[in-house]
Amino acid sequence: QGWQAFKNDATEIIPELGEYPEPPPELENNKTMNRAENGGRPPHHPFETKDVSEYSCRELHFTRYVTDGPCRSAKPVTELVCSGQCGPARLLPNAIGRGKWWRPSGPDFRCIPDRYRAQRVQLLCPGGEAPRARKVRLVASCKCKRLTRFHNQSELKDFGTEAARPQKGRKPRPRARSAKANQAELENAY
């Protein structure tokens, strides 16, 4: 799910290359993490579960061709995509009446691109057109970057993780002195 956010009109993701045909199971599981109907908890994990690999800011690789109009790169480029959670979940849903709100237990961090690299690619065009050279910006590394209450939805959307988006039926964090976090947190490395 996360990697699709990096697709734009100038690129096409080629699943048939076999390097990353579909979102990994970790991301599939993550989709359930923030659904209001699940109370913010993954449905099938027992309370004691500690899975180090599942909840971390990871650099996933996928391969894509670069396109520009009818022209396409001679070779696919390999890019990193930032995926996963930065540390244990830091939100606990609290029900008050019919509404739900969050209580934080720490700053909100997101796994986002850190450094980029430029790569020169040759684009082949149909109809005997001369090949074009083009520079593309690719993600080179990821980091756990802190979000503030001032980040708006459009900024969050760019991070490409469902967990970054506000959920229906939930109010923003209240001003709470105390902090509790998701009961089903899993161990993690940043």
């Epitope: 309370f47 800011c57 930065c86 540390g87 244990p88 979940a89 830091r90 606990l92 934080p104 237990s105 720490g106 700053p107 961090f109 980091k143 756990c144 970057k145 802190r146 503030t148 209450r149 001003r175 709470a176 002195r177 105390s178 902090a179 509790k180 976090a181 998701n182 009961q183 089903a184 947190e185 899993l186 161990e187 993690n188 940043y190």
Partner: antibody
Framework: EVQLQQSGPELMKPGASVKMSCKAS????????MHWVKQNQGKTLDWIGE????????GYNQKFKGKATLTVDKSSTTAYMELRSLTSEDSAVYYC????????????????WGAGTTVTVSS | DIQMTQTTSSLSASLGDRVSISCRAS??????LNWYQQKPDGTFKLLIF???RLLSGVPSRFSGSGSGTDYSLTIYNLEQEDFATYFC?????????FGGGTKLEIK
């Protein structure tokens, strides 16, 4: 008064494991994440990781992954850190620190610190 | 990881002086910068959070400023109890990282 009381000094052999404690008092233990920080002989500080006392969920600095394990005992309002496969590099003072929150500025900081546990690894 | 650099490892000053301690981050940390004081007995105390916000109970002679990658802690009218080691810490990117510390000594 909010306090974090840490266990006493430890003299350990290389290869051994040590488990130190951090007893919290004066506040609701499950309402604040507990963090651990290492201070080596050169006085530099390294953040080890955090644990949520409410759930037991922990997160670690990659540098300490496999070295440190954080746990809590809610009934005794105590946080623990175990260090394994000790080497001389692990000789340091280890601090537990509570992560506090300022709701006006939406900011977080280590507002209460323990006095530290000195670990010496020597053969 | 973000590197936090306190270029001055030790600083000598006299009672009543004004001193500034600098801290530089290897990248922009969006003002998520805290300052801590460590006394000779090893005890830590938070002084300033979010670059310039004084924690309740901390004397007003302590002041923080900065933005982007460059930050500083200024202590006005130095008192005996201020002679200690001061650390900066960034809270913008995980893992949290600290500066190497600046030891303030009496001249």
């Amino acid at each position: 008064e909010v306090q974090l009381q840490q266990s006493g000094p430890e003299l350990m052999k290389p290869g051994a494991s040590v488990k130190m404690s951090c007893k919290a008092s004066g506040y609701t233990f499950t309402d604040y994440n507990m963090h651990w920080v290492k201070q080596n002989q050169g006085k530099t500080l390294d953040w080890i990781g955090e644990i949520n006392p409410n759930s037991g969920g922990a997160g670690y600095n990659q540098k300490f992954k496999g070295k440190a394990t954080l746990t809590v005992d809610k009934s005794s309002t105590t946080a623990y850190m175990e260090l394994r496969s000790l080497t001389s590099e692990d000789s340091a003072v280890y601090y537990c620190a509570r992560l506090g929150y300022d709701d006006i500025y939406d900011d977080w900081y280590f507002d209460v610190w323990g006095a530290g546990t000195t670990v010496t690894v020597s053969s | 990881d973000i590197q936090m650099t306190q270029t001055t490892s030790s600083l000598s000053a006299s009672l009543g002086d004004r001193v500034s301690i600098s801290c530089r981050a290897s990248q922009d940390i969006s003002n998520y910068l805290n300052w801590y004081q460590q006394k000779p007995d090893g005890t830590f105390k938070l002084l300033i959070f979010y670059t310039s916000r004084l924690l309740s109970g901390v004397p007003s002679r302590f002041s923080g400023s900065g933005s982007g990658t460059d930050y500083s802690l200024t202590i006005y009218n130095l008192e005996q109890e201020d002679f200690a080691t001061y650390f900066c810490q960034q809270g913008d990117t995980l893992p949290y990282t600290f500066g190497g510390g600046t030891k303030l000594e009496i001249k």
